[in-house]
Interface confidence: low
C-alpha cells in the first residue's frame, strides 16, 4: 500500500549528508540487498563522508519504501542518537 508523504531519509536528506559519520556501516548493511557491488564500490571511492552520502543518495530515487526502511534501520543501528535528534526536529 502506498504511504503518504516523504520517507524519513528523504525528509532529512541534507542533514544526513552533513551528519552521518559511519557510512561504512550503512554500506555493509545495504550491500547485496539494495546496493549492487558497483554501487557499493562507487560510494566507498568517494573521499569524504558527505560525498559518500551524496553518492548513496544518488541511488535512492530507484528505491521503494521498504528499501529506504533498510537504510533507516542501518542508521538507527549506527547513529541512533542522530535519528532520534532528527525525529524530534
Amino acid at each position: 500500500a502506498a504511504k503518504p508523504g516523504l520517507h524519513f531519509i528523504d525528509q532529512h536528506r541534507a542533514a544526513l549528508i552533513a551528519r552521518v559519520t559511519n557510512v561504512e556501516w550503512l554500506l555493509d548493511a545495504l550491500y547485496g540487498k539494495v546496493l549492487t557491488d558497483e554501487q557499493y564500490q562507487a560510494v566507498r571511492a568517494e573521499p569524504t563522508n558527505p560525498s559518500k552520502m551524496r553518492k548513496l543518495f544518488s541511488f535512492t530515487p530507484a528505491w521503494n519504501w521498504t528499501c529506504k526502511d533498510l537504510l533507516l534501520q542501518a542508521l538507527r543501528e549506527s547513529q541512533s542518537y542522530l535519528v532520534e535528534d532528527l525525529e524530534r526536529s
Partner: nanobody, 112 residues
Framework: QLQLVESGGGLVQPGGSLKLSCAAS????????MSWYRQAPGKERESVAR????????YYADSVKGRFTISREDAKNTVYLQMNSLKPEDTAVYYC?????WGQGTQVTVSS
C-alpha cells in the same frame, strides 16, 4: 539481558598508549558487528572504529587511522580498542556499541 562493560580508560600523557576492553553478555556476540564511539565534552558522539562479525570488515574514523586498532576475541565475548600515539584531542568518554545498545563508557584523558 544485553550488557556491555567497558574498561581500560585512564589518564595518559600525549604520545602514550591505552587498551580499552568491552566485555559483552546477553547476546550471541560472534554474530554482531561491534563498534567504539567517543564523546568529548560539548561535542557530538562520534564513531571511532567498527569491526564486523568475523572481523572481516574494519572501519576507522579518519582522525584515528594508523593510531587505533580494533579487534575482537569471540571466545571471550570481548572487543578491544588499542590506542597508540594518543593526542589531547583524543580525550573523551569512549563507548562500546552494538545494535542500539551502549555501554556506560570509560573516560580517556590525554594530558601532560
Amino acid at each position: 539481558q544485553l550488557q556491555l562493560v567497558e574498561s581500560g580508560g585512564g589518564l595518559v600523557q600525549p604520545g602514550g598508549s591505552l587498551k580499552l576492553s568491552c566485555a559483552a553478555s546477553g547476546f550471541t556476540f560472534s554474530r554482531y558487528a561491534m563498534s567504539w564511539y567517543r564523546q568529548a565534552p560539548g561535542k557530538e558522539r562520534e564513531s571511532v572504529a567498527r569491526i564486523s562479525s568475523g572481523g572481516g570488515t574494519i572501519y576507522y574514523a579518519d582522525s584515528v587511522k594508523g593510531r587505533f586498532t580494533i579487534s575482537r576475541e569471540d571466545a571471550k565475548n570481548t572487543v578491544y580498542l588499542q590506542m597508540n600515539s594518543l593526542k589531547p584531542e583524543d580525550t573523551a568518554v569512549y563507548y562500546c556499541y552494538v545494535g542500539g545498545f551502549w555501554g556506560q563508557g570509560t573516560q580517556v584523558t590525554v594530558s601532560s
